[in-house]
């Protein structure tokens, strides 16, 4: 099985009440603008076939995609939460920059690609949906990486 290295975040990253609240507020605000309730991006399907030890690496991929292709392109929306949450998530991404998997990660990339394809297919409403699931991203990062 692939071995993951440096795929850890200190639990203190997830114990800051202010930024946790802002992340959840941003997700709530965006989910109010999300009219596509049939589709879920971060759920059981995302983790299908991925072992517990590989989940932080998977969530790193999801986090980087969310930052680069969702949050930065929508960075002038959802005041005043966006401008606080994005730098926080960017710091987490930076801390996971050395998180790698030694060996085959094709099964992980396949799952992440499905999420990316769903967001792309939905266009701007897919981006809004991804922002609306930042609470799930936050919780999944916490569960997988601490």
């Amino acid at each position: 099985a692939p071995i993951s290295s440096h795929c850890r975040l200190d639990k203190s990253n997830f114990q800051q009440p202010y930024i946790t609240n802002r992340t959840f507020m941003l997700a709530k605000e965006a989910s109010l603008a999300d009219n596509n309730t049939d589709v879920r991006l971060i759920g059981e399907k995302l983790f299908h076939g991925v072992s517990m030890s590989e989940r932080c690496y998977l969530m790193k991929q999801v986090l980087n995609f969310t930052l680069e292709e969702v949050l930065f392109p929508q960075s002038d929306r959802f005041q005043p939460y966006m401008q606080e949450v994005v730098p926080f998530l960017a710091r987490l991404s930076n801390r996971l920059s050395t998180c790698h998997i030694e060996g085959d990660d094709l099964h992980i990339q396949r799952n992440v690609q499905k999420l990316k394809d769903t967001v792309k297919k939905l266009g701007e409403s897919g981006e809004i949906k991804a922002i609306g699931e930042l609470d799930l991203l936050f919780m999944s990062l916490r569960n997988a990486c601490i």
């Epitope: 930052l67 680069e68 292709e69 930065f72 392109p73 929508q74 960075s75 002038d76 929306r77 959802f78 005041q79 005043p80 966006m82 401008q83 994005v86 730098p87 701007e124 981006e127």
Partner: antibody
Framework: QVQLHESGPGLVKPSETLSVTCSLS??????????WAWIRQPPEKGLEYIGR???????SYNPSLKSRAAISVDTAKNQFSLTLSAVTAADTSFYYC??????????WGQGTLVIVSS | QPVLTQSPSASASLGASIKLTCTLS???????IAWHQQQSGKGPRFLMR???????NKGDGIPDRFSGSSSGAERYLTISSLQSEDEADYYC?????????FGTGTKVTVL
Amino acid sequence: QVQLHESGPGLVKPSETLSVTCSLSGGSISSSSHLWAWIRQPPEKGLEYIGRIHYRGSVSYNPSLKSRAAISVDTAKNQFSLTLSAVTAADTSFYYCARLDMGAIDKWGQGTLVIVSS
Amino acid sequence: QPVLTQSPSASASLGASIKLTCTLSSGHSNYDIAWHQQQSGKGPRFLMRVNNGGSHNKGDGIPDRFSGSSSGAERYLTISSLQSEDEADYYCQTWGTGTHVFGTGTKVTVL
């Protein structure tokens, strides 16, 4: 030091399409954390937002101009452009390009005056 | 979408201080804003960003005489030790609903 420089036609006839381009130097338009915007200002009047784009193509417009405005990006040339169709004298303005950093405009071009007249 | 209200004009003597106000509309009192200066015949220049806690991030090369603060829905720009080159129009800007808005601007005259 990032610099923005607008270039435009100077004069456009009514009902025609106005095109202005913004060239970026000292930085990359492919900076993932920035958005690139167009703002205009009729002579002796206030500022009006037109729209913005991310280098990946995500774009949004001022609702009042959405039907006539189109913003595009050319990463190879490190440029972004605005076209405004069916112009009238009311579109006579200084057109400014700008950089957005987490919503705030933090860099402006020097502006280019476009006059709509026959 | 938010609306920004600015008074049309303000004046103060050379060397004095002046405080400009930008008021956010109801429901948007926790929004960040940016302040921009436009000297006569020139393009706008970014001065600073001000959040609802009053902290501000200034643009490159902006003198220490310029500072930002906040109270409720009001965002302030204070220019201390006013210089002749500070005579200009000052605009506030905000965003957040998929579009951006500007205040109508305050014309500052140095007496």
